[in-house]
C-alpha cells in the first residue's frame, strides 16, 4: 500500500481467484484518542472502533472511501483505491492501446519543435468518474524538472461501436536547451483513477524522436511563362525553432491529381520552392521534416493547380 | 581546427548533411530488433559517450561568441565513433557488407575528422570508447543502440556546420 | 577476388614456435575480423582467436591463452598466429577464416612437430 | 562454454536419398549456426549461416532449420559431391565451438 495524495491509498492486489488480498491499517488523522468508531460509504455499518483500523482488501467491494468519527462528528476520510496486476503486469483497463507505432502504446507525444515544449494524449471509452493527473521529468536518477498542465478532454468521437474520448496535456521542460543532444529521456507518467481502480501508465522519449513540425505556411503557386511548370513557394512554419540556418527543414512536393489516386513521385528540396508540373484540376502539396533527423514528416499542406 | 582557425564551414556542412544519411540509411540494416530485449536501454547509451551537451556553446549564440569549444566536442565525437564503428561490434559477426552504409559511414567519419583536424595537430587526447571484444550476440543490439546514439550526435554536428556556413563563413 | 592465401607448411621441434602468415585481398581488411581454427589429423574443428585489424583487438580461446599470439600488418593486409611452446600435439592443418558467416577460409597450413 | 553434439557422427547413404544431420546445443544460441562440409585435404566450406540462410552458390537441396539449441541440416536429394564430413558451429559467445562432424558414406 502507498499514498496517491493526502488520505489517498493504492492498494496493489495481485488479481486472482481466491487470492489471499492485502491486509491494511488505516489510522484516523485525529488527536482524539477513544470514542472513534468507523465505517465505510459501502455500508454504513460500523466497522470498528479506535483510532486504527485494519481490514482485508481482496476486491473492489473492499474499496472505497473509510470515514472515522466521534459521535456524529467527522474526523478524517481514507480512500483506498485498487491497483491490479494479472499474471504479473499491471492492468491498463482504463486506457484505449493505440496500437502505433507499437502495442501497448498507451499514451503518444508530439512537439512541434525543439522548445522543450510538448503534448502527449490518450484515448479511453469512459467519460464520467474518471480523473487523470500527469507528472514528467528528465532523466530518472537525478531528474531534471518538466512542467505539465491539467489533462484536457480534446475530443470526443463517436462511431458505430463505441465513444471514443480523447484527452491530451501539455508540457514544458524548464530548462530546455534546444541545441543539445539529448542524452537523458524525458519520462512521462500518467495517474488514471476510475471509480475505485487506479492505474499508470508512462512513456518515454527524446524530444528529437517526437518532433513533427507543423505542415509549411504561406504555400503560394506561380505559373511559369510559357511552360505547363509552375513554381511553387512555401514558408517555414511559425512554430518550428529558430533560427532557421541552425534548425533547418527539409521539404517534400508532390503533385496530386483529381482522382487523388494517382500522385507522381515525391521531389525533396531543402529550399524552400521547387519547380513542377501542373495539370489543371491537381493539387500540390507540400511537407516538412527535420533535415538532419529522421523524425516525423508533418502534416501536407495544399495549393490548388487552377 | 588548430589555434583559432576556422573550418571549412562549406565542406563540413556537405560532409556532416551527408554523415546524417549514412546514418540513417546505416539503421534498417541492423536485422530484427524483435529479437533483442532492450535491457537496461535507460540511459547506458550515454554511458561514455561524448554527448554535445548545453554547455559545450553549439548553439547559435555560443556558436557566435566562440566556435572553439563547441568544434573540440563535435571532434572528440567523430574519433569516439569513428573508433566504435572499426571494433568487432561492427567487424565482427553478424557480418556487415564492407561498402554498404556502415563501412561509408567509418569512412566519412574520418573524412569529416580530417577536416577538422589537418595532419599533424593532435592537441589533445579525445576520449577513447572502452573497447572489450563483444559478444555476437550482444552485437545487433549494441549497433543499434550505438547507430541511434550516433544519428543525434550527427544532427547536432550538421545544424553547427549549416549555420556555420550560412553565417560564419568568410 | 577475394581470397585468403596462407603460408607454406612447416616443421618444427618440440618447445619451439611457428608463425602462420594469411595474406588477405579482395576486401577492405579492416572491415572483418580474421579468426583462426585448427584441424588435428583425423580430428574436429577448434577454434584458437580472432582478430580485429581495425584496432588490433584480440580475442583467444582459453585453451591456447599464453602460447598464441594473433597479430595483423594493416600496410600489407596479412594477419599472423604464432603458436610457441610446439608440442607433438601441436601438429594440425592451421587455417585463417574471416567472420564466420561470410564464407572465406585459407587453404590451411600444415604444421608437423616432431622431433 | 557451449558444447555443440552433433548426430549421427556417421552415417551411410544413396544418391537420391534425403540425409538429415542434427545439431544441439547446451545452451541457447538463437540462429548464430553455421553448417560447414569439409572434404579431405581442403578448407571447410560454408553452406548455411544463421541457421537458415543459404550461403551464395550452394544448390538449394541445402537447406537449414532451428531455433535456440536443436538444428538440422538437411539434404534433399544425396548427390554425388555431397559426399564429405559436415559441421556445424555456433557463433552465439567466445569459445567459438564445432560439432564433432557427420561424415556422410556411400552406402
Known amino acids: 500500500i502507498w499514498e496517491l495524495e493526502k488520505d489517498v491509498y493504492v492498494v496493489e492486489l495481485d488479481w486472482y481467484p481466491d487470492a489471499p488480498g492485502e491486509t491494511v491499517v488505516l489510522t484516523c488523522d485525529t488527536s482524539e484518542e477513544d470514542g472513534i468508531t468507523w465505517t465505510s460509504e459501502q455500508s454504513n455499518k460500523v466497522l470498528g472502533s479506535g483510532k486504527t483500523l485494519t481490514i482485508l482488501v481482496k476486491e473492489f467491494g473492499d474499496a472505497g472511501q473509510y470515514t472515522c468519527h466521534k459521535g456524529d462528528k467527522v474526523l478524517g476520510h481514507s480512500k483506498v483505491l485498487l491497483h491490479k496486476k494479472e499474471d504479473g503486469i499491471w492492468s491498463t483497463d482504463i486506457l484505449k492501446d493505440q496500437k502505433e507505432p507499437k502495442s501497448k502504446t498507451f499514451l503518444k507525444c508530439e512537439a512541434k519543435n525543439y522548445s522543450g515544449h510538448f503534448t502527449c494524449w490518450w484515448l479511453t471509452a469512459i467519460s464520467r468518474d474518471v480523473k487523470f493527473s500527469v507528472k514528467s521529468n528528465r532523466g530518472s536518477s537525478d531528474p531534471q524538472g518538466v512542467t505539465c498542465g491539467v489533462p484536457t478532454l480534446s475530443a470526443e468521437r463517436v462511431s458505430v461501436d463505441h465513444t471514443e474520448y480523447k484527452f491530451s496535456v501539455e508540457c514544458q521542460e524548464d530548462n530546455a536547451c534546444p541545441a543539445a543532444e539529448e542524452s537523458l529521456h524525458l519520462e512521462v507518467m500518467l495517474d488514471a483513477i476510475h471509480k475505485l481502480k487506479y492505474e499508470n501508465y508512462t512513456s518515454s522519449f527524446f524530444i528529437r524522436d517526437i518532433v513533427k513540425p507543423d505542415p509549411p505556411q504561406n504555400l503560394q503557386m506561380k505559373p511559369l511563362k510559357n511552360s505547363r511548370h509552375v513554381e511553387v513557394s512555401w514558408e517555414y512554419p511559425d512554430t518550428w525553432s529558430t533560427p532557421h540556418s541552425y534548425f533547418s527543414l527539409t521539404f517534400c512536393v508532390q503533385v496530386q491529381n483529381k482522382n487523388k489516386k494517382e500522385k507522381k513521385d515525391r521531389l525533396c528540396v531543402d529550399k524552400t520552392s521547387a519547380t513542377v508540373m501542373c495539370h489543371k484540376d491537381a493539387k500540390i502539396r507540400v511537407q516538412a521534416r527535420d533535415r538532419y533527423y529522421s523524425s516525423s514528416w508533418s502534416e501536407w499542406a495544399f495549393v490548388s493547380c487552377n | 581546427v588548430p589555434g583559432d582557425s576556422s573550418p571549412a564551414w562549406t565542406q563540413c556542412q556537405q560532409l556532416s548533411q551527408k554523415l546524417c544519411t549514412l546514418a540513417w540509411s546505416a539503421h534498417p540494416q541492423m536485422g530484427p530488433m524483435e529479437l533483442l530485449r532492450e535491457e537496461g536501454d535507460e540511459e547506458t547509451t550515454s554511458d561514455d559517450v561524448p554527448h554535445i551537451q548545453c554547455e559545450d556553446g553549439c548553439d547559435p549564440q555560443g556558436l557566435r561568441d566562440n566556435t572553439q569549444f563547441c568544434l573540440q566536442r563535435i571532434r572528440q565525437g567523430l574519433f569516439f565513433y569513428e573508433k566504435l564503428l572499426g571494433s568487432d561490434i561492427f567487424t565482427g559477426e553478424p557480418a556487415l557488407l564492407p561498402d554498404g552504409p556502415v563501412g561509408q559511414l567509418h569512412a566519412s567519419l574520418l573524412g569529416l575528422s580530417q577536416l577538422l583536424q589537418p595532419e599533424g595537430h593532435h592537441r589533445e587526447t579525445p576520449q577513447t570508447p572502452s573497447l572489450h571484444p563483444s559478444q555476437p550476440w550482444q552485437r545487433r543490439l549494441l549497433r543499434f543502440k550505438i547507430l541511434r546514439s550516433l544519428q543525434a550526435f550527427l544532427a547536432v554536428a550538421a545544424r553547427v556546420f549549416a549555420h556555420g556556413a550560412a553565417t560564419l563563413s568568410p | 577476388q577475394v581470397q585468403l592465401v596462407q603460408s607454406g607448411a612447416e616443421v618444427k621441434k618440440p618447445g619451439s614456435s611457428v608463425k602462420v602468415s594469411c595474406k588477405a585481398s579482395g576486401y577492405k581488411f579492416t572491415r572483418y575480423v580474421m579468426h583462426w581454427v585448427r584441424q588435428a589429423p583425423g580430428q574436429g574443428l577448434e577454434w584458437m582467436g580472432y582478430?580485429?585489424?581495425?584496432?588490433?583487438?584480440?580475442n583467444y580461446n582459453e585453451k591456447f591463452k599464453g602460447r598464441v599470439t594473433i597479430t595483423a600488418d594493416k600496410s600489407t593486409s596479412t594477419a599472423y598466429m604464432e603458436l610457441s611452446s610446439l608440442r607433438s600435439e601441436d601438429t594440425a592443418v592451421y587455417y585463417c577464416a574471416r567472420n564466420w558467416d561470410t564464407g572465406l577460409w585459407g587453404q590451411g597450413t600444415t604444421v608437423t612437430v616432431s622431433s | 562454454d557451449i558444447q555443440m553434439t552433433q548426430s549421427p557422427s556417421s552415417l551411410s547413404a544413396s544418391v537420391g536419398d534425403r540425409v538429415t544431420i542434427t545439431c544441439k546445443a547446451s545452451?541457447?544460441?538463437?540462429?548464430?549456426l553455421t553448417w560447414y562440409q569439409q572434404k579431405p585435404g581442403k578448407a571447410p566450406k560454408l553452406l548455411i549461416y544463421?541457421?537458415?540462410s543459404l550461403e551464395t552458390g550452394v544448390p538449394s537441396r541445402f537447406s537449414g532449420s532451428g531455433s535456440g539449441t536443436d538444428f538440422t541440416l538437411t539434404i534433399s536429394s544425396l548427390q554425388p559431391e555431397d559426399f564429405a564430413t559436415y559441421y556445424c558451429q555456433m557463433y552465439w559467445s567466445t569459445p567459438f565451438t564445432f560439432g564433432g562432424g557427420t561424415k556422410v558414406e556411400i552406402k
Open positions: 545452451d541457447h544460441i538463437l540462429k548464430f
Open positions: 582478430i580485429n585489424p581495425y584496432n588490433d583487438g584480440t
Open positions: 544463421g541457421a537458415t
